[in-house]
């Protein structure tokens, strides 16, 4: 971790829960406002690799819904429609950090948790040829 | 928010803090144990819609670092090399939660925020506006 | 249930010609990907052709690229293997093989084979 | 095209054993992998597909593990009926390509 200097006007924290546990506010702030939520929205249907989305739900988690991608095809689709056999969709993956009720059913308490949620779908060449 | 009947284990939080206020255990429990994390790290540079990872960090955001995906081309590359200009590589979009620092230089109070990322490319076919 | 059979084997000089047939039934052929898979006697799998569910894609390995088309009718149920230029290392066991998606890319379900033997 | 080098060729076990076959591809293939089981004069059967997934009505005593170049079936509890010639099939690049397979029987 980064060591910061307190801020006189930040909350207690007694040693023992430092910097184990911490005090996070649920309001979210959005920085996306002037991002169009909808922009790659049909990705996923006009893609060489395209992917089908399905809802992962768990009550006991924050976000409670992620969407996760899995692709249609084990290979690309080409301009007329059909597969290239010659070329693999594959998926993107990212770690992202979700909140788990910890203990669980507990309201107001979390433990961070990362999990691995592909996002979508990608097309790329099975084989590496290494050049002498 | 869904309603969940707390469990007498749970830690007290007053009603004015809840559910705005929680307290967040930072020792990640990491789910992927199983996923190598090397498997899709060359899809970056094998993709027909390949891309550039940047870092973004910022020490008063939780996690600091964060790699962004940037699209090397406008068009996708075909199997010569060359780049196709009839389809395009766009960058797959997802929102992801992190913690930010408030007030500011707190080590033990945060916000949870939105963010967009772009975490990889994908090659799509353009949209064609007909004209009447 | 899912049935194949495949027809058209025989006894044929090298530089001969043959054509394989596969009869599918119990499934909606036309949304499957079917391949061909040949097992020379005591050896293992060899992939010969895919193609996939409208016959829009097709694939061949090097050892029969240009002497071998596959092709279906899928009005018909039917997977063909036209079979030109053989050679004594074709002969085989030819097991038609159908994919579980559209395209050809693993097998659930074979034909009980049928045996091309090139000789002279 | 990948090579897929399946070993050992042949093993010989007793009714309840544990059997462990590996498939090694020349390089990596991303969890593309198929296992089928032949028994002599049949057509091959498919068991596991995507390295690790079950066909329906496959006894559970088959499984799949690996990734990378390096893959392993394993049949818990060896039993008579599981006497066959097992491939392993990599579906990650052009042409597909099969082990040379292993022979297992029953000592």
């Known amino acids: 971790g980064i060591a910061i200097p307190r801020n006189s006007g930040c909350p207690n924290s007694e040693d023992k829960n430092f910097p184990r546990t911490v005090m996070v506010n649920l309001n979210i702030h959005n920085r996306n406002t002037s991002t169009n939520p909808k922009r790659s929205s049909d990705y996923y249907n006009r893609s060489t690799s395209p992917w089908n989305l399905h809802r992962n739900e768990d009550p006991e988690r924050y976000p409670s819904v992620i969407w996760e991608a899995k692709c249609r095809h084990l290979g690309c689709v080409k301009a007329d429609g059909n597969v290239d056999y010659h070329m693999n969709s594959v998926p993107i993956q990212q770690e992202i950090l979700v909140l788990r009720r910890e203990p669980r059913h507990c309201p107001n308490s979390f433990r961070l948790e990362k999990i691995l949620v592909s996002v979508g779908c990608t097309c790329v060449t099975p084989i590496v040829h290494h050049v002498a | 928010g869904i309603a969940i009947p707390r469990n007498s284990g749970c830690p007290n939080s007053e009603d004015k803090n809840f559910p705005r206020t929680v307290m967040v255990n930072l020792n990640i429990h990491n789910r992927n144990t199983s996923t190598n994390p090397k498997r899709s790290s060359d899809y970056y540079n094998r993709s027909t819609s390949p891309w550039n990872l940047h870092r973004n960090e910022d020490p008063e955001r939780y996690p600091s670092v964060i790699w962004e995906a940037k699209c090397r081309h406008l068009g996708c590359v075909k199997a010569d090399g060359n780049v196709d200009y009839h389809m395009n590589s766009v960058p797959i979009q997802q929102e992801i939660l992190v913690l930010r620092r408030e007030p500011r230089h707190c080590p033990n109070s945060f916000r949870l925020e939105k963010i967009l990322v772009s975490v990889g490319c994908t090659c799509v076919t353009p949209i064609v506006h007909h004209v009447a | 249930e899912v049935q194949l059979v495949e027809s058209g084997g025989g006894l044929v000089q090298p530089g001969g010609s043959l054509r394989l047939s596969c009869a599918a039934s119990?499934?909606?052929?036309?949304?499957?990907?079917m391949s061909w898979v040949r097992q020379a006697p005591g050896k293992g799998l060899e992939l010969v052709a895919i193609i996939n569910h409208n016959g829009g894609s097709t694939f061949y390995p090097d050892s029969v690229k240009g002497r071998f088309t596959v092709s279906r009718d899928n009005s018909k149920n039917t997977l063909y293997l036209q079979m030109n230029s053989l050679r004594a290392e074709d002969t085989a066991v030819y097991y038609c093989?159908?994919?579980?998606?559209?395209?050809?890319?693993?097998?659930?379900?074979w034909g009980q084979g049928t045996l091309v033997t090139v000789s002279s | 095209d990948i090579q897929m080098t399946q070993s050992p060729s042949s093993l010989s076990a007793s009714v309840g054993d544990r059997v462990t076959i590996t498939c090694q591809a020349s390089?990596?293939?991303?969890?593309?992998l198929a296992w089928y089981q032949q028994k002599p004069g049949k057509a091959p059967k498919l068991l596991i597909s995507g390295a690790t997934s079950l066909e329906t009505g496959v006894p559970s005593r088959f499984s799949g593990s690996g990734s990378g170049k390096d893959y392993t079936f394993t049949i818990s509890s060896l039993q008579p009926e599981d006497i066959a010639t097992y491939y392993c099939q990599q579906y990650w690049s052009v042409p597909w390509t099969f082990g040379g397979g292993t022979k297992v029987e029953i000592k």
């Open positions: 390089e990596d293939i991303y969890d593309r």
């Open positions: 093989a159908r994919d579980p998606r559209h395209d050809g890319y693993f097998f659930d379900y």
């Open positions: 119990g499934f909606t052929f036309s949304t499957y990907g």
